[in-house]
């Protein structure tokens, strides 16, 4: 009989095992295990009839197509077999074991245990046929196996083989090299290439194989296997394998399609092509004069293009436009884009303007073109070239005049300071009295007035001040504080000032020239309580011509000490000889109050200990700080007055011979002005130098050397 | 003629906010200041504060400066006066004064729950 | 802030006599820059809004009449009425113009 076993181990004895088994029997053991297994058969205890060849009593091992053993015997003979230590593995997962036994046993045979179990196939290790095996990588599990690829390979649905994903392959350069994939490594399995080549219109492709060309091939079919297809629009070529690469193909097209198969067999190193577009042919180009073209070749295709470039000094003039380069192309149908351009000396045009300057020509007939030269100059005595520049420049290759310091950037032609056109008389020991100023003389002296039509009625006063460049003027900060306030400081509002500057005489202000602010600037810690700190500027509107009736006073060096004791300066002003009177009445015409004429005085720098003492004895809360120094005589007569407020206490500067502000009309009193012990208190203006540089927006090194050569 | 004329008296209960028009016209409304000063029932004048219409710039009485906010309205001409958290001691007439020269004719803010 | 202290509150005046009212101010109000007293006087009439006589202390603003003058320099000052009209009853107030500005407590003019 047959028994049917289907675990995965199991015990086989021969019938009445232990006790000896019965003639005439015969019984089969069908084992079968699930795939991926064998089974291992072994006998633990094995005793049957002894015959030739197991004619007898035998154990018979098979599959379903091959005997695996036969058994019989007690201990192995020439003739017969016994299992001993053997070990019996199917190839599958089935195994037939039959037992039989004849008819008569002389003795008393005990028969036999045997032993089964499932045990995992190595399909990684035991699969030769290619057919069946993995492409790549192959990974055992008890029960079965599975296959993977190498990275930038796809399992293929058959799941052994490798396949790449090269479908989507497109060439748009001039040339190029495409190769079958991992080439010249065997080309990967079960794979559709596809690489398209498209260049622009007007290109045609043409094909070279290179190197090693082998695509699995056929004896008698051609190429069934493995193969290359070339597709130029509706045409095909091939397809082409085997180890002889096919001839250079001129396709005559600007779009290609090259297919690759492979199937799913077969170890070939594939192929590599390389292409190049060709085109047509341009005529020969000359390069202009003073010029050339870039790249220089013998031949020019369509596509090629030239850099037309010009020699130093020269511009490419295309149709009636400069240019620093132009570029030409060849085009599909054998033409130029353009004709060649002309190559023209660099003009640099009429040089830009100089404020306050001139110009000159150095090349004849007032060249303006590469490599001439022009000189800038400076409208003297009021303006001077800052830095001592030389003022020359060339016409430079890239069509600017150009300087060797300072590039393409203008010179600056700063106003001269403190140098009157007429000469101030010479100082003397003793004071003379005030006196009518001749027309420049105080060049730098300013009327400020100042008319807040804010308010009804209006308010109206008017101060004195210093230009210090053509921009800006230099006063005192009680001339331009809004008057309305009572602790607070407030400038006044810009559309209420006016600056009258070159005037001589208050009564004709028509050779004046007046200008109104741009700007009002506070010093931030002006104190209306003790006038520290009275100084501003005011920017004009507009820069104003210098000339011999208006021209800057000088600033004097960064000094703490401000003027030395007993220095005679020099102040001007319009302001008043009575202090009773009205602003309203000294503006209007006609007034005797206002000095119609700029008046000046000498007056002396009275040291601080004793300016100082003669203030403390007053009733009153005055002080006299350090940013004020203070002038005038013990025994009065001469002094400043309300409406010269802001004026500029002028000091001749021995090293740099100009005059120099040190100081600005601040206050007095209480008593009249000009009173006996009673000094004027000014501004000390060099404790401020580098505060009003950086409200002029100049470093203090532009201006500073004029004062200090 | 030049001449500032007000807006229309007003009822506002505590705590509300009040706000006054005050149009000018006849002379430069930019360049002069406008100043408001207010006048209790049967008080005197107090001054409240001012503003330049042209620049935006203001002063304020010290009293008022957390609850009164003045602005103008170039384009017509126009200044305001905004008075916040409003109390009983707030009814007056309130003036608009041209720097001090030409006053509008008032406006009545009567201030009850 | 600067305080106006005025008087007398209240004045009584036969018609065609001299009226005279006082300001006097916690401070100087002559500004030495523009040689003025910032200080002006208004009349307010019943009903009315108050109207400018006199500013700078002592300059009459145009169609006031001259029977109004004012006077002083500093921190005293003095608006007179010469003769007084019957269109005169009014309260007339002080302000200074510092800012914050500030008035007067006013004094109140009546026919005796």
């Known amino acids: 009989h047959t028994v049917e076993l289907n675990n995965m181990f199991g015990q086989i004895q021969s019938p009445g095992y232990p006790d000896s088994y019965p003639s005439d029997s015969e019984v089969t053991w069908n084992i079968t295990v699930p795939d991926g297994f064998r089974i291992k058969l072994y006998f633990m205890h094995f005793n049957l009839e002894s015959s030739y060849l197991c004619e007898y009593d035998y154990v018979k091992v098979e599959t379903e197509d091959q005997v695996l053993a036969t058994f019989c015997g007690r201990e192995t003979t020439d003739t017969e077999q016994t299992p001993g230590q053997e070990v019996v593995l199917s190839p599958g997962s089935f195994m037939s074991i039959t037992f039989r036994s004849d008819f008569s046993n002389e003795e008393r045979f005990t028969g036999f245990d045997a032993h089964y179990m499932a045990v995992d196939v190595d399909e990684c290790k035991e699969r030769e046929d290619e057919e069946l095996s993995c492409d790549h990588y192959c990974h055992n599990y008890i029960g079965g196996y599975y296959c993977s690829c190498r990275f930038g390979y796809i399992l293929h649905t058959d799941n052994r083989t490798c396949r790449v994903e090269c479908s989507d392959n497109l060439f748009t350069q001039r040339t190029g090299v495409i190769t079958s994939p991992d080439f010249p490594n065997p080309y990967p399995k079960s794979s559709e290439c596809l690489y398209t080549i498209e260049l622009e219109e007007g290109f045609m492709v043409n094909l070279q194989f290179e190197d090693i060309f082998d695509i699995e091939d056929h004896p008698e079919v051609p190429c069934p296997y493995d193969y290359i297809k070339i597709k130029v629009g509706p045409k095909v070529l091939g397809p082409f394998c085997g180890e002889k690469a096919p001839e250079p193909i001129s396709t005559q097209s600007h779009s290609v399609l090259i297919l690759f198969h492979s199937d799913n067999s077969g170890e070939n190193r594939g192929w590599r092509l390389s292409y190049r577009a060709a085109g047509n042919e341009c005529p020969e180009l000359q390069p202009p004069v003073h010029g050339k073209i870039e790249p220089s070749q013998a031949k020019y295709f369509f596509k090629d293009q030239v850099l037309v470039s010009c020699d130093t000094g020269y511009k490419v003039l295309k149709d009636n436009v400069e240019m620093d380069t132009f570029q030409i192309e060849c085009l599909k149908d054998g033409t130029w884009s353009n004709k060649i351009p002309t190559c023209k000396i660099v003009d640099c045009r009429a040089p830009g303007e100089l404020e306050h300057g001139l110009i000159t020509f150095s090349t004849r007939n007032n060249l303006t073109t590469y490599k001439s030269e022009i000189k800038y100059s400076c409208q003297e005595p009021y303006y001077k070239m800052l830095n001592n520049n030389t003022g020359i420049y060339t016409c430079s290759a890239q069509g600017v005049w150009m300087n060797k310091v300072l590039g393409r950037s203008l010179p600056t032609c700063l106003p001269e300071c403190g140098q009157p056109s007429r000469s101030l008389p010479s100082l003397v020991k003793r004071i003379i009295g005030g006196r009518n100023a001749e027309p420049g003389l105080f060049p730098w002296q300013a009327l400020i007035v100042v008319e807040d039509t804010s308010r009804v009625p209006n308010d109206k006063w008017f101060g004195s001040g210093a230009l210090l460049s053509a921009s800006w003027i230099l006063t005192a900060a009680h001339v331009l504080r809004s008057q309305r306030r009572d602790t607070t400081v407030i400038p006044v509002s810009k559309e209420h000032v006016t600056v009258y500057l070159g005037l001589h005489d208050v009564r004709d202000k028509s050779g004046a020239v007046n200008s109104s602010a741009a700007r009002v600037v506070l010093h931030p810690d002006f104190n209306i309580q003790n006038y520290n700190h009275d100084i501003a500027l005011v920017q004009l509107q507009e820069p104003v011509p210098l000339g011999p009736h208006v021209m800057p006073v000088c600033l004097p060096r960064l000094e703490p000490e401000g003027p030395a004791p007993h220095m005679l300066g020099l102040v001007a002003g319009w302001g008043i000889s009575n202090p009773n009177v009205t602003v309203d009445e000294i503006i209007s015409s006609g007034t005797r109050t206002l000095s119609d004429v700029l008046q000046y005085v000498k007056l002396p720098v009275v040291p601080h200990a004793e300016c100082k003492t003669s203030y403390e004895s007053r009733s009153g809360n005055y002080s006299v700080t350090e940013n004020m120094f203070c002038a005038g005589y013990y025994e009065g007569g001469k002094d400043t007055c309300l409406g010269d407020s802001g004026g500029a206490f002028v000091i001749f500067d021995d090293l740099s011979q100009r005059w120099v502000v040190q100081g600005l009309v601040s206050w007095g009193g209480p008593e009249e002005c000009g009173s006996k012990q009673v000094y004027g208190v000014y501004t000390k203006v060099s404790n401020y130098v580098d505060w009003v540089w950086e409200q002029m927006g100049l470093p203090q090194s532009v201006v500073e050397p004029q004062v200090e050569r | 003629q030049v001449q500032l004329v007000q807006s229309g008296a007003e009822v506002k209960k505590p705590g509300a906010s009040v706000k006054v028009s005050c149009k000018a016209s006849g002379y430069t409304f930019t360049g002069k200041w406008i100043e408001w000063v207010r006048q209790a029932p049967g008080q005197g004048l107090e001054w409240m504060g001012e503003i330049l219409p042209g620049s935006g710039s203001t002063d304020y009485n010290e009293r008022f400066k957390d609850r009164a906010t003045f602005t103008a309205d170039t384009s017509t001409s126009t200044a305001y006066m905004e008075l916040s958290s409003l109390r009983s001691e707030d009814t007056a007439v309130y003036y608009c004064?041209?720097?001090?020269?030409?006053w509008g004719q008032g406006t009545l803010v009567t201030v009850s729950s | 802030d600067i305080v106006l202290t005025q008087s007398p509150d209240s004045l009584a005046v036969s018609l065609g006599e001299r009226a005279t009212i006082n300001c006097k101010s916690s401070q100087n109000l002559f500004n030495s820059r523009t040689r003025k007293n910032y200080l002006a006087w208004f009349q307010q009439k019943p009903g009315q809004s108050p109207k400018l006589l006199i500013y700078?202390?002592?300059t009459r603003e145009s169609g006031v009449p001259d029977r109004f003058s004012g006077s002083g320099s500093g921190t005293d000052f003095t608006l007179t009425i010469s003769s007084l009209q019957a269109e005169d009853v009014a309260v007339y107030y002080c302000?200074?113009?510092?800012?914050?500005?500030?008035f007067g407590g006013g004094t109140k003019v009546e026919i005796k």
């Open positions: 700078w202390a002592s």
């Open positions: 302000k200074q113009s510092y800012i914050p500005f500030t």
């Open positions: 004064v041209r720097s001090e020269d030409l």
